[in-house]
């Protein structure tokens, strides 16, 4: 499956709105920052068949938009913004969606995608609990939104890298 | 490669103006902060102001406020230091750091080489 | 401003020995810590972040501990090329703020 040209831009421009819905100085957030744990070895590439990959990048865009998707957030977030971001991450998941169905036909996705699943789901999870003990404040959304832009950098490469593979 | 390549040494006079430059490479520029730091001869390391290369945010340290200023051109990957009317006591090496901004990762990772800065009459 | 205060200002020591500098912020940092080597004429390095993070690259003879307002930074078998001065520098507020540094000699 090759994934469009215009995915590839979709998720530039996710990250160039992301990267506007900056609301408060980030410098009165360090005190707020976390470890969250970003599952890098599951983006690298190397492992991967290509299925695989693909099934990761799903569910790291599935999670990224239900965490953008919750009232929460629809309070932290300037609207249109918000909506903008949201549209570019469900085009996505659709681009994505018809890859996983046209791969999983070739190949066979090993147990292994699983855990590589699990991780991301894991990952989400403990920012959502970041949030919640933080009583979702400015700042803990400030350094959620400076954490998925750096997962979705990731998510870039990783797409960069399995177009090269093509 | 991770890069952080400053502008030359400098000898100017007092009450002349000086602006010193940071270049980054082998890395996103707006992903990362650039911090300032001055070290005068024979001394310590004194934090003076940082910037956000996205937004071109700037916060300073009080001793600095008002007495230089950062900047940032994302388009060329290169932050600025500079200084309006110099003193004989801006003479020091001045080093620029990439710091990951809220993200959880190492601060100050990679250094500039230092610009030497000279004022003298 | 948060103050950091280093202990010793500077020490002597021999090739193999353990060496301990500890740093004390004025108030409570929690782990925002980190710890940077300087040789003469060079940039600083960073060693040590977040208090016990070794930095990549970086020799597993360094060790950071701590938390709240006491840190510390061990050289659990000094080597020729750790002669340098020391600094351990507050993360978790600005103005981020350096200890005077900690200079190790050869004795």
């Known amino acids: 499956c090759d994934l469009p040209q215009t995915h590839s831009l979709g998720n530039r421009r996710a990250l160039i709105l992301l990267a506007q819905m900056g609301r408060i100085s980030h410098f009165s957030c360090l005190k707020d920052r976390h470890d969250f744990g970003f599952p890098e070895e599951e983006f690298d590439g190397h492992q991967f068949q290509k299925a695989q990959a693909i099934s990761v990048l799903h569910e790291m865009i599935q999670q990224t938009f239900n965490l953008f998707s919750t009232e929460d957030s629809s309070a932290a977030w300037e609207q249109s913004l918000l909506e903008k971001f949201s549209t570019e991450l469900y085009q996505q998941l659709n681009d994505l969606e018809a890859c996983v169905i046209q791969e999983v036909g070739v190949e066979e996705t090993p147990l292994m995608n699983e855990d590589s699943i699990l991780a991301v789901r894991k990952y989400f999870q403990r920012i959502t609990l970041y949030l919640t003990e933080k009583k979702y404040s400015p700042c803990a959304w400030e350094v959620v939104r400076a954490e998925i832009m750096r997962s979705l950098s990731f998510s870039t490469n990783l797409q960069k890298r399995l177009r090269r593979k093509d | 490669e991770v890069q952080l390549v400053q502008s030359g040494a400098e000898v100017k006079k007092p009450g002349e103006s000086l602006k010193i430059s940071c270049k980054g490479s082998?890395?996103?520029?707006?992903?990362?902060?650039i911090g300032w730091v001055r070290q005068m001869p024979g001394k310590g390391l004194e934090w003076m102001g940082i910037?956000?290369?996205?937004?071109?945010?700037?916060a300073y340290s009080p001793s600095f406020q008002g007495q230089v200023t950062i900047s940032a051109d994302k388009s060329i990957s290169t932050a600025y230091l500079q200084w309006s009317s110099l003193k004989a006591s801006d003479t020091a090496m001045y080093y620029c750091?990439?710091?990951?901004?809220?993200?959880?990762?190492?601060?100050?990772?990679?250094w500039g080489q230092g610009t030497l800065v000279t004022v003298s009459s | 401003d948060i103050q950091m205060t280093q202990s010793p200002s500077s020490l002597s020591a021999s090739v193999g020995d353990r060496v301990t500098i500890t740093c004390r912020a004025s108030q409570s940092i929690n782990r925002f810590l980190n710890w940077y080597q300087q040789k003469p004429g060079k940039a600083p390095k960073l060693l040590i972040y977040?208090?016990?993070s070794l930095q990549s690259g970086v020799p597993s003879r360094f060790s950071g501990s701590g938390s709240g307002t006491d840190f510390t930074l061990t050289i659990s078998s000094l080597q020729p090329e750790d002669f340098a001065t020391y600094y351990c520098q507050q993360a978790i507020d600005l103005p981020f703020t350096f200890g005077q540094g900690t200079k190790v000699e050869i004795k």
């Open positions: 977040a208090a016990s």
């Open positions: 910037i956000d290369p996205s937004d071109s945010d700037t």
């Open positions: 082998g890395y996103s520029f707006t992903s990362y902060w």
């Open positions: 750091a990439r710091h990951p901004g809220l993200n959880w990762a190492p601060d100050f990772d990679y």
